[in-house]
Amino acid sequence: RRRRRDTHFPICIFCCGCCHRSKCGMCCKT
């Protein structure tokens, strides 16, 4: 079952070179 937190917006991942940025960091979709 999904954790309750998963339904909170924004949904974020930690990644490198994503989300129109060259650095690493959080990338979120709302």
């Epitope: 924004p10 974020c12 991942i13 930690f14 490198c16 070179g17 690493c24 960091g25 959080m26």
Partner: antibody, heavy 115, light 110 residues
């Protein structure tokens, strides 16, 4: 539930190579990148970098460029950290950690480098 | 790099009292309307244990004695009341740009 299980402690001599593993379970391995963190004895936590588990592309923090290599065995949901030409200052506990809606950590692998 | 400065370095608290730990970031860790600051507890020989995520959210299974607050560059972890099991080192971590950690605050019982 999400789990990261790391390989056991290692005792190595200077100049040797060590490869430690981090096996993930409870989620789709390729959905979330894997980070590696170093903790020297009695010291704080230092981010070593990240590997994209979908493409296999590694990103290394400035202090960990050169002797350090991240790799994957995707079919086994396992990430690896290899350290070449070991030095005494590499003695530390190494953690894998991933962000999958929350931060999850492996139990740590102690690498001791001693002649 | 975003530098995190924790204070104090160590803290002696009486059982049942309040412990407050500060973490200051060299630049804002806010994005997307969230503060990407997290707090961990670490005991010897164990991995860090997540207590608080995104500045103020209590991780599942963590007692409500732990709370977090703050935004942008200034953050606080509060333990109230302190129990014997809380003896540990506490770290702040930001994930807005790379991953960086505070230097740690060691909490002991007075």
């Amino acid at each position: 539930q999400i789990q990261l299980v790391q390989s056991g402690p290692e005792l190595k001599k200077p100049g040797e190579t060590v490869k430690i593993s981090c096996k993930a379970s409870g989620y789709t391995f390729t959905n979330y990148g894997m980070n590696w963190v170093k903790q020297a004895p009695g010291k704080g936590l230092k981010w070593m970098g990240w590997i994209n588990t979908y493409t296999g592309e590694p990103t290394y923090a400035d202090d960990f460029k050169g002797r350090f290599a991240f790799s994957l065995e995707t079919s086994a949901s396992t990430a690896y950290l290899q350290i070449n030409n070991l030095k005494n200052e590499d003695t530390a506990t190494y953690f894998c950690t991933t962000y999958a809606t929350s931060w999850y950590w492996g139990q740590g692998t102690l690498v001791t480098v001693s002649s | 790099d975003i530098v995190l400065t924790q204070s104090p370095a160590s803290l002696a608290v009486s059982l049942g009292q309040r412990a407050t730990i500060s973490c200051r970031a060299s630049e804002s860790v806010d994005s997307y309307g969230n503060s990407f600051m997290h707090w961990y507890q670490q005991k010897p020989g164990q991995p860090p244990k997540l207590l608080i995520y995104r500045a103020s959210n209590l991780e599942s299974g963590i007692p409500a004695r732990f709370s977090g607050s703050g935004s942008r560059t200034d953050f606080t972890l509060t333990i109230n009341p302190v129990e014997a099991d809380d003896v540990a080192t506490y770290y702040c971590q930001q994930s807005n740009e790379d991953l960086t950690f505070g230097q740690g605050t060691k909490v002991e019982i007075k």
